[in-house]
């Protein structure tokens, strides 16, 4: 059966959590992504930056977590308006930010 | 300005009653949750319980589950603590504080009254 | 239910650095706030939602939240910072807000 979309997003925060948690060297070595705007359509905007991102398992699974909040396909080289123009961040800073959006959607009860 | 008026503090036997209220004024007391923490003398911070803005629900901490109960007037713009079978360990300064209202009440107290102290005591 | 783990007591001399943590499991996935409780006064919110500042705190205040623990920074360190800091979180398991113990700042 279909996970509940609270459940869905605690588990999302969790996965955020642990990324950040168990950062050793450079998240995905530095990398850096096109900084998002949080307050609309987070998610696929979220998605449509990390997924330029290649090689790095350690957001692998956050890349699948996002894909099942977004209700439409996203592909690499894909962009929406919701990128925040010609400003890009680390990766680590990204999630970072993302995760505290998301416990502050999470508070909200905006669970999709 | 905005302010939280807590009264209704005094000395109270074990096994009684003691009614607190908070008076708000100052901003739109309907759109917050609320909610009373006590201090008991040289500890920290223990949060005793809240209520939604609309009253509809109420959470409270295990160890007055049962014998308090929180309520609110939102014409009035007060809030009251109702705690019955008091104990020992009930002595405290009782602080009434809100928090801005989401489907969750995880938001910050930006703002506390000054506090009323209760003495239980035989 | 959930519990939050704070030191006692933290020193630090004027002018230098003091960090204050908050321990608790997978906290990193909660919104944590911060209070400063000086002696006879009510709490005064200093940090909420991990990292955010009230307009009126200092900008010597901030706070992070990482993992298992939360953590507030004083930089800076004044005479009148001297208080005890309290961490506090929302338990969505248990429907009640939790307090960490307190942590009394000494500044020598």
């Known amino acids: 059966s279909p996970v509940p979309p609270s459940t869905a997003l605690k588990e999302l925060i969790e996965e955020l959590v642990n990324i950040t948690q168990n950062q050793k060297a450079p998240l995905c070595n530095g990398s850096m992504v096109w900084s998002i705007n949080l307050t609309a359509g987070v998610y696929c905007a979220a998605l449509e930056s990390l997924i330029n991102v290649s090689g790095c398992s350690a957001i692998e699974k956050t890349q699948r977590m996002l894909n099942g909040f977004c209700p439409h396909k996203v592909s690499a080289g894909q962009f929406s308006s919701l990128r925040v123009r010609d400003t890009k961040i680390e990766v680590a800073q990204f999630v970072k930010d993302l995760l505290v959006h998301l416990k502050k959607l999470f508070r909200e009860g905006q669970f999709n | 300005q905005m302010q939280l008026v807590e009264s209704g503090g005094g000395v109270v036997q074990p096994g009684r009653s003691l009614t607190l209220s908070c008076a708000a004024s100052g901003f739109e007391f309907r759109t917050y949750g609320m909610h009373w923490v006590r201090q008991a003398p040289g500890k920290g911070l223990e949060w005793v319980g809240v209520?939604?803005?609309?009253?509809?629900?109420?959470h409270y901490a295990d160890s007055v589950k049962g014998r308090f109960t929180i309520t609110r007037d939102n014409s009035k713009n007060t809030l009251n603590l109702q705690m019955n079978s008091l104990r020992a360990e009930d002595t405290a300064v009782y602080y009434c504080a809100r928090a801005p209202q989401w489907y969750l009440t995880a938001e910050a107290f930006d703002l506390w009254g000054q506090g009323t102290m209760v003495t239980v005591s035989s | 239910s959930y519990v939050l783990t704070q030191p006692p007591s933290v020193s630090v001399a004027p002018g230098e650095t003091a960090t204050i943590t908050c321990g608790g499991n997978?906290?990193?996935?909660?919104?944590v706030h911060w209070y400063q409780q000086k002696p006879g006064q009510a709490p005064v919110l200093v940090i909420y939602?991990?990292?955010d500042r009230p307009s009126r705190i200092p900008e010597r205040f901030s706070g992070s939240n990482i993992g298992n623990t939360a953590t507030l920074t004083i930089e800076d360190v004044e005479a009148g910072d001297e208080a005890d800091y309290y961490c506090q979180v929302w338990d969505y398991s248990s429907d009640t807000m939790v307090f960490g113990g307190g942590t009394k700042l000494t500044v020598l």
């Open positions: 997978l906290i990193g996935a909660k919104l």
């Open positions: 209520i939604w803005d609309d009253g509809s629900n109420t």
């Open positions: 939602d991990d990292s």
